[in-house]
Interface confidence: low
């Protein structure tokens, strides 16, 4: 039987009446244009909604926007357009919301041609009041807040100037000209690239990388011949042009660019690219594009310094620079990532890793599904997940995979069951154990969201027709109830719930269309009365993550430790609540070879945990660049996986000797760097 239709599904008592009392409609007094929504702060209930409408006139486009504010999670909205003097707000800049609970908001206004600079509206009280500020420049990018201090803002101008404000946008100072890209680092540091000759495009590969740690009083050039740069975790990466040809290589720094090491990654040519797929303070996943327009490349995982890389996955699907990749961090379970590979026959297949890229495998076929026509053997196939690539291809996939750190183990995604992703209409699948096992949750494509840390899952069918029904489940997607939230169906445009999945409110956005007009409308449903009581100790059960073989003493060991979680029982209908904290009990594992990656010059043959010397390097001294000096590596081929906490057990020996020679191949050695002050 279809999910939710078997006899075991108990109905939630009197839910229609309970939800009807907690369903709030708001019709926006707007013609339908575009709508954008932002949450201001965490657990504040404050939502800002910006609606914009363009009227194309013969010579120009006339625009009108309205700003609405809710402070009760979207149940009621107040028109606050007058707070921004009825100004037209530029939607391409969005609403710049300050970090953490700063309550800061910056809106960028449209200004008439010929004006000296742009205009912003600033609020530091969760959008209760706004201050209008005229800028001495025209912004090219959204204002960027320093992660450490929300009073510090940076922006690039249309003239490529780098502008900084130290008082939350009240006063601005141009600290550098000819800037291509700027990013905040840690400790209010700004990194940026500059061009010397014509433009960012013309100087690509000849840019300089600069750093200021005092908001523009002094500068240090930390790299030359730069193509691009990126920040990930504690790593600063730069792709640098080679001296002799048009290839470039990745260099990495862990000290804000003072010293650089060349990453042991393949160099790339003009048409290729590098991409940081994911990074934390321990390590980085790096994609290196294949030569030619293949649409795939190789994933490498780094050591703890970001220098030595192990090949993690071949034929990784990634279409073009800034293009589509399905790489997804499953945030509901440590070490789990999902992505797609392009097989030799051009079909796309989903792969999953449970150990941070150490090993990749196909997703297990869901118990309640049959293999489709892509399967050569209809009894043996896998689940394949639709993500960004499928969405870009306009397949019938309304949403990417979803997981939340506080909804432990839950992953929801569209997929098909076969030998490869199918172009057919997908169904929705759920995993409650971080991707080890899967179940078909809903027939056909849906929008979905997680509420109350996994206590409730809400879904709406993806349809071209107007809708008036929402589905919800209180048992992690096993059984579903349907609730008609309005008599008059609406054209659905999106589901909105507070980021972090702690809320019990969901907003359904859409528009109504009549003969003459169409209007935005939202329905906010509060599920608090469905989950009548707070969860107690008896509602939780102990769950060992990554458990595959309960008989094995090392069962659940991933990256050197195992974790037991307290998880809500599927049968418990209660509130985790806004203050719910994931309870976990870690325990350290003994080290095995699985806890080590292969060192520079070594690789793992397939289905073998031993690291073997690369044939082409056999008998050679292993020399590589570290901080601009050549190092001599004496190793038996192993290096501890970043973030691995194992103790005892096997312990391969490793030693590095300084060769006291300069690296000829390192373009970012310290003596090439210089400082200057304003």
């Amino acid at each position: 039987s279809a999910p939710g239709e078997d006899e075991e599904c108990g109905r939630v008592r009197d839910f229609v009446a309970k939800l009807a009392n907690n369903t709030h409609q708001h019709v926006f007094d707007d013609l339908r244009g575009s709508v954008s929504l932002s949450w201001v702060g965490d657990s504040t209930g404050v939502i800002l909604v910006l609606t914009t409408f363009h009227v194309p006139l013969v010579i120009m486009t006339f625009g009108q926007s309205k700003l609405y504010r809710s402070e009760d999670y979207g149940k009621n909205f107040k028109d606050i357009t007058d707070l921004i003097n009825n100004t037209f707000i530029r939607t391409e800049f969005g609403m710049a919301i300050g970090p953490e609970n700063s309550g800061k908001v910056v809106l960028t206004a449209e200004v008439s041609g010929g004006s000296r600079g742009g205009r912003i509206f600033r609020s530091s009280d969760f959008a209760k009041n706004f201050v209008q500020t005229d800028l001495p420049f025209h912004p090219l990018t959204q204002m960027m807040y320093s992660p450490q201090n929300s009073d510090y803002l940076l922006a690039l101008s249309t003239e490529n100037g780098l502008w900084v404000s130290k008082n939350f946008g009240g006063k601005w100072e141009e600290i550098h000209k000819a800037v291509c890209l700027a990013k905040w680092g840690s400790d209010n540091t700004i990194f940026f690239t500059t061009y010397a000759n014509g433009s960012c495009k013309a100087d690509l590969g000849a840019l300089e990388l600069w750093r200021t740690s005092d908001l523009g009083k002094s500068f240090k050039t930390i790299g030359v011949k730069i193509y691009s740069f990126g920040l990930g975790g504690r790593f600063l990466f730069a792709s640098v042009m080679a001296d002799k040809d048009t290839t470039r290589r990745i260099h990495v720094s862990t000290d804000q660019g003072d010293t650089w090491s060349m990453a042991q990654l393949p160099s790339v040519g003009q048409e290729q690219f590098y991409s940081i797929l994911a990074a934390n303070d321990d390590m980085v996943f790096m994609h290196v594009d294949e030569p030619g327009d293949t649409g795939f490349g190789t994933i490498f995982t780094s050591d703890d310094r970001g220098i030595v890389y192990s090949k993690s996955l071949d034929r990784h699907l990634y279409t073009t620079t800034g293009g589509e990749t399905d790489f997804t961090n499953v945030t509901s379970l440590r070490g789990v990532y999902i992505t797609s590979v392009l097989s030799e026959d051009n079909s796309i297949q989903t792969m999953i890793t449970f150990d941070q890229g150490g090993r990749w495998t196909h997703l297990r076929k869901p118990e309640n599904s049959e293999c489709d026509a892509t399967a050569k053997n209809k009894n043996e196939c896998s689940l394949h997940i639709h993500a960004s690539y499928s969405i870009s291809q306009k397949l019938n996939v309304p949403m990417a995979p979803l997981s939340e750190p506080n909804a432990v183990g839950i992953v929801i995604a569209h997929g098909s069951v076969g030998d490869a992703i199918s172009v057919m209409v997908p169904d929705v699948y759920i995993s409650d154990d971080g991707g080890y096992s899967w179940t078909k949750m809903l027939e056909g494509p849906h929008y979905y969201t997680i509420l109350d840390s996994g206590g409730i899952i809400v879904a709406i069918e993806h349809s071209s027709r107007p809708i008036n029904v929402i589905k919800f489940s209180t048992d992690e997607g096993q059984c579903w109830q349907t609730y008609t939230f309005t008599r008059d169906p609406i054209y659905f445009t999106g589901l909105a719930s507070e980021p972090g999945a702690r809320s019990m409110n969901i907003s359904i956005w859409g528009f109504t269309e009549s003969f003459l007009t169409s209007q935005w409308v939202s329905y906010t449903i509060d599920f608090k009365d469905i989950l009548e009581r707070n969860c107690e100790e008896k509602d939780y059960t102990i769950w060992l993550a990554h458990s595959t073989d309960p008989e094995d003493y090392e069962d659940g060991c991933i990256l050197g430790y195992k974790e037991q979680f307290l998880r809500l029982r599927k049968s418990s209908v209660c509130q985790n609540g806004r203050d719910y904290v994931v309870t976990k009990q870690p325990s350290i594992c003994l080290c095995s070879l699985e806890d080590f990656l292969c060192d520079f010059g070594y690789y793992r043959p397939e289905n073998d945990s031993k690291c073997v010397e690369q044939p082409e390097l056999k008998g050679h001294d292993l020399e590589f660049c570290l901080y601009g000096r050549e190092e001599h590596l004496t190793t038996n081929g192993y290096r501890k996986i970043p973030g691995d906490k194992c103790q005892g057990g096997v312990n391969p020996v490793r030693e590095v000797k300084d060769l006291k020679k300069k690296c000829t191949s390192n373009f970012l050695s310290p003596e090439k760097q210089n400082s200057k002050s304003n």
Epitope: T294, N346, S347, A373, A420, I421, S422, V423
Partner: antibody, heavy 129, light 107 residues
């Protein structure tokens, strides 16, 4: 040999429904998708939709959405196409065609499309009052 | 949906001559294109798939080329049995769509 045999000609009144069958033989029925294509008198070919023989999920062209239903019976290796609320413009020859489109899904260079390689003989449906 | 446009609508060619048929897509279909031949009273027959690969049993005089939005079907030396209507069809994005057809007739 591989063949698709369709049911015989039908004459229907406007507003009625018609159900055309297509029996596959000579290959593993569940390995290939099946498309339905129609051709009005003196006109070109028009794709109606596609059905996955395993699971039975179908995808229809927008034009026929709500009026067409494609089903299959794996025990007899037969697919069916039912078109409801018939009107005179539905007078056409209806073909089923084996369509391996699901075998290789969309790659960056494009899914490698194998084409509709086996066709039924066609079923003439006449809608007339 | 992707619109497929074939030209010319009718092509008059003498036996033994070369025939070149064009098919244009309203957006890129990569190489997800097939060509079919249809004779009066018969079902269509697959000639070319993947834009350029001949289907089983199709004579070498039929060849397909192109990628993206522009495609060509070439019949190098027309035989009497080749006079028919030819259709192109894309399968890049649903719904699959056909061109309007090119009728190849005897000059």
């Amino acid at each position: 040999q591989v063949q698709l045999v369709q049911s015989g000609a039908e004459v229907k009144k406007p507003g009625a429904s018609v159900k055309v069958s297509c029996k596959a033989s000579g290959y593993t029925f569940t390995k290939y998708y099946m498309s339905w294509v129609r051709q009005a008198p003196g006109q070109g070919l028009e794709w109606m939709g596609i059905i996955n023989p395993i699971g039975g999920s179908a995808s229809y062209a927008q034009k026929f959405q709500g009026r067409v239903t494609m089903t299959r019976d794996t025990s007899t290796s037969t697919v069916y196409m039912e078109l409801s609320s018939l009107r005179s413009e539905d007078t056409a020859v209806y073909y089923c065609a084996r369509d391996p489109s699901g075998i290789a899904a969309a790659g960056p260079a494009g899914r490698y499309y194998y084409g509709m390689d086996v066709w039924g003989q066609g079923t003439t449906v006449t809608v007339s009052s | 949906e992707i619109v497929m446009t074939q030209s010319p609508a009718t092509l008059s060619v003498s036996p033994g001559e070369r025939a070149t048929l064009s098919c244009r897509a309203s957006q890129s279909v990569s190489s997800n294109l097939a060509w079919y031949q249809q004779k009066p009273g018969q079902a269509p027959r697959l000639l070319i798939y993947g834009a350029s690969t001949r289907a089983t049993g199709i004579p070498a005089r039929f060849s397909g080329s192109g990628s993206g939005t522009e495609f060509t079907l070439t019949i190098s030396s027309l035989q009497s049995e080749d006079f028919a209507v030819y259709y192109c069809q894309q399968a890049r994005l649903g719904p699959w769509t056909f061109g309007g057809g090119t009728k190849v007739e005897i000059k």
